[in-house]
Interface confidence: medium
């Protein structure tokens, strides 16, 4: 006799994830969060070297594992490519010989960017008669990566993405935010331990060049940076005000940038054309004064004149030589290293640094993401999912663009444009064949880079400036459209509004977003709302500016236009009402996760239609064992407990600043809130926390 | 190698003044903080005074008032101007860099260590009796 429930070892394995997690004892019309996961939290406790946990947090621990294994392991067969992948990260691992160098090599390098003033003996002798800000700006930018008070970068032209532009930007702060500056309150830990962190690793280099420590002079010059900094951030905007790319946009020539944006620093007028070409020369690119430049932040650049008037290029240089520094404190020895906890546990909450061989697969994977990618896949990735995905993302494609008929909001000629736009998003699924069949071209990627196992210090200098230098080579070449935003090695999912591409990585096609084992609730409720997620990112606040071919072109009518913003405004009050009590009660912030939160909600509803098509077509699957849930039901479940977890309060504080995402339990409360399925799943009466009356829906 | 020469120390009767001149050679005179600093006799040291490199001044109680610390950066010089000058300022004055220690200890902390500074000078001798 059948009963109806999946007995398969798949079936079970499934139940018990899924009941281990859960709060069955909660009412999930009350909070499907506690519901959900409930016995996540009360089964685990963060890390001490985790900022967050949870469910997606421990997939990538786990990839981590499956990292370290493939990378330690040399093999006679290793080509070119993984054999170098393999020494960056023994020369990562080795701490006897990070430690028995000290910060020799970091000592090393600064004569290189002009030095660091607060622990150098005569820096205005020694650096002063050479040192101009274009030098020295420039510098760090074309040969490091690193952007210190003017952020000039190569990227894609946004209104004519074939084409790759000069970039003019505000750059990033050594805080996670600019709201870090004002130093009272919630962020007067970080800025006192930011001002120690940066006198301790001055006091370190110090001692290391055998030169005379002065406690008061360290101070003196330290807090100044700190004061310059906070100058910096207080002049940059608001993510909030940032997040209009049409806005964003200021094409101009660079002599017009020298008229409207004149600076003056060390007395002398900053040249905006030499600047550019201290930068473009290190890649053979000479620039004139009608070269085109998009200015993304006039604001900013505005506001920094009167602030780099007031301070002498020993603050100045104080401060861009700290910024590089602090990122390379974590690769020196232990004593550096060491300097950096106290900052570490302000921003993180963190008390143990992530395990070394944690941290140096994932640089590993960061710096060399296509030979990573290959031995992750040849490790760990089952080929067929290929297919299976293939079809979800058709399935879900299909439903986004008939949804668009049950707008009403929307005009004909607007949903036309939209459909089109959805038929042109291009899939790239687990990771491009090149990686594991094209020896000759994943050789030639890291041709240029050679690795000493006793040098991880320079190994790491070496990426920095074969990366940057790539980068700003691409100005002169077209935009490859073909290539991947991301490695394959990642549990993440991307949409590219330049590219009009979505990419699920190897990384993400695993339990409990996919398997071709699970059941199809469970994939529809992971992988499928993770798909219709990223396919809606081409139509939220930000993706929809862009056309079908990823050009920032507005190809909305008035009336559409105003619409979409009206139906975006009840997601921005709806999240914007969430206070996090991990965060000291702080409320999310509604605009700048409105991207993200839009995705989610669209993401759902076109996954659970898809759902529901698929039974219409193949009828109910079995229930699950031990779990006294049908399908409809398990694909809210599945769906929320992606998002179990929980933050360290430092971290919350910093990431309800910093991510664009609402926090995990948000997420869920949010968008289940504003589904009619769900609350028609769990029978939750009308104004329960759960099913409110008032519900917002964009796509 | 960095050089601290202390100068103006003598004999002045009390409620008398003297202009004491730190001289500094071989290091960025300007990038650096300055202190005085005194040992009376037969007794430990004692911070009297500190500058900063933007010029702001330090002083311990007793002295405030009394003394005025400020410097020549043009001339690479710190002087100490002491007035209304009494017998327990008796004592060898010593310029000195590159403290390792914050002025706030300086002050509760009251006796310091040569070690407490990275560099000394030689010091002047300064007599306050009648």
């Known amino acids: 006799y059948d009963d109806g429930i999946c007995k398969s070892s798949d079936c079970i394995k499934s139940a018990a994830r899924l009941i281990q997690n859960m709060d069955a004892t909660t009412e999930p019309c009350t909070d499907f969060f506690k519901y959900a996961c409930g016995g996540w939290l009360k089964r685990n406790v963060i890390p001490e070297t985790s900022s967050r946990y949870g469910n997606f947090d421990i997939l990538r621990d786990e990839l981590e594992v499956v990292l370290k294994d493939v990378l330690q392991e040399p093999k006679t067969e290793d080509i070119v490519a993984v054999q170098k992948a393999k020494a960056l990260y023994r020369s990562c691992i080795n701490e006897s010989a990070i430690d028995s160098r000290g910060g020799e090599p970091l000592l090393k390098l600064l004569p290189d960017i002009y030095g660091w003033p607060v622990a150098t003996e005569n820096w205005e002798q020694k650096y002063g008669a050479s040192w101009t800000a274009e030098k020295a700006i420039a510098q760090l930018n074309s040969k490091y990566g690193k952007k210190v008070l003017i952020n000039l970068f190569v990227g894609t032209d946004d209104k004519n993405s074939v084409n790759h532009v000069i970039h003019i930007d505000q750059p990033r702060l050594g805080l996670p935010s600019r709201d870090y500056y004002e130093c009272t309150g919630i962020y007067k830990e970080a800025c006192t331990a930011y001002v120690d962190f940066m006198i301790s690793v001055a006091r370190l280099i110090r001692q290391e060049e055998r030169l005379p420590i002065d406690e008061n002079q360290l101070a003196l010059e330290m807090n100044k940076v700190m004061e310059l900094e906070k100058e910096i951030a207080n002049a940059t905007a608001k993510p909030e005000d940032r997040n209009d790319p049409m806005l964003l946009y200021n094409k101009m020539t660079l002599a017009q940038i020298q008229n409207n944006f004149s600076l003056e620093i060390n007395g002398k007028p900053f040249s905006w054309l030499n600047f550019t070409n201290e930068i473009m020369s290190t890649v053979n690119i000479s620039i004139t004064n009608e070269e085109d430049v998009v200015v993304y932040a006039p604001e900013y650049l505005t506001k920094l004149k009167p602030i780099l008037t007031k301070y002498s290029a020993r603050d100045l240089q104080n401060l861009m030589s700290w910024r590089f520094i602090m990122d390379l404190v974590s690769s020196l020895s232990r004593t550096y290293k060491e300097s950096r906890n106290a900052f570490r546990k302000a921003l993180y909450g963190t008390t143990s640094e992530t395990a070394t061989w944690r941290r140096c697969a994932n640089y590993v994977n960061g710096n060399m993401e296509n030979a990573v990618g290959r031995l992750y896949v040849e490790a760990a990735f089952a080929g067929e999912s290929k297919h299976v995905v293939e079809d979800l993302i058709a399935q879900i494609r299909e439903v986004f663009i008939q949804t668009l008929d049950d707008l009403t909001w929307m005009d004909a000629e607007t949903k036309k444009r939209a459909e089109e736009k959805a038929l042109a998003i291009k899939e790239r699924i687990g990771y491009p064949d090149d990686i594991v069949s094209n020896d000759n071209k994943l050789n030639n990627e890291y041709l240029e880079l050679n690795y000493k196992e006793d040098e991880y210090f320079e190994n790491i200098i070496q990426n920095l400036k074969f990366s940057q230098s790539k980068q700003l080579k691409k100005l002169r070449e077209k935009v490859d459209k073909d290539e991947w935003i991301s490695g394959a090695a990642v549990v993440n999912a991307f949409y590219s509004s330049g590219r009009n591409q979505i990419v699920f990585p190897a990384g993400i096609l695993q339990p409990p977003f996919f398997s071709a084992q699970q059941s199809n609730s469970l994939n529809y409720g992971g992988i499928g709302m993770v798909i219709g997620h990223e396919i809606t990112h081409g139509f939220d606040d930000n993706g929809r500016n862009f056309n079908k071919d990823g050009d920032l072109v507005d190809w909305w009518t008035q009336q559409s236009a105003s619409n979409f913003k009206e139906q975006s405004q009840c997601m921005v009050y709806q999240y914007g009402n969430f206070s996090w009590d991990l965060a000291g009660g702080q409320h999310l912030n509604g605009i700048n996760t409105l991207g993200e939160n839009i995705a989610d909600n669209g993401g759902l509803g076109q996954a659970y239609r898809a759902y529901q098509n698929y039974i219409k077509k193949n009828g109910e699957e079995k229930l699950l064992p031990g779990l006294d849930l049908n399908h409809k039901q398990l694909f809210f479940l599945n769906f929320a407990q992606v998002w179990c977890g929980t933050y360290r309060p430092e971290y919350a504080v910093n990431s309800i600043k910093t991510d664009v995402h609402s926090p995990g339990n948000f997420r869920i409360i949010g968008t289940l809130q504003n589904s009619a399925e769900f609350s028609e799943a769990f029978h939750c009466r009308k104004n329960s926390y759960m099913n409110p009356e008032k519900k917002c829906r964009v796509w | 190698q960095v050089q601290l020469q202390e100068s103006g120390g003598g004999l002045v009767q009390p409620g008398g003044s003297l202009r004491l001149s730190c001289a500094a050679s071989g290091f960025t005179f300007s990038s650096y903080w300055m202190y005085w600093v005194r040992q009376a006799p037969g007794k430990g040291l004692e911070w009297v005074s500190a500058?900063?490199?933007?010029?702001?001044?330090y002083y311990t109680d007793s002295v405030k008032g009394r003394f005025t610390i400020s410097r020549d950066n043009a001339r690479n010089t710190m002087y100490l101007q002491m007035d209304n000058l009494k017998s327990e300022d008796t004592g060898v004055y010593y310029c000195a860099k590159d403290a390792k220690i914050l002025i706030a200890r300086m002050r509760s902390q009251g006796r310091l260590s040569r070690s407490d500074f990275g560099s000394w000078g030689q010091g002047t001798q300064v007599t306050v009796s009648s």
């Open positions: 500058i900063n490199t933007e010029g702001n001044t």
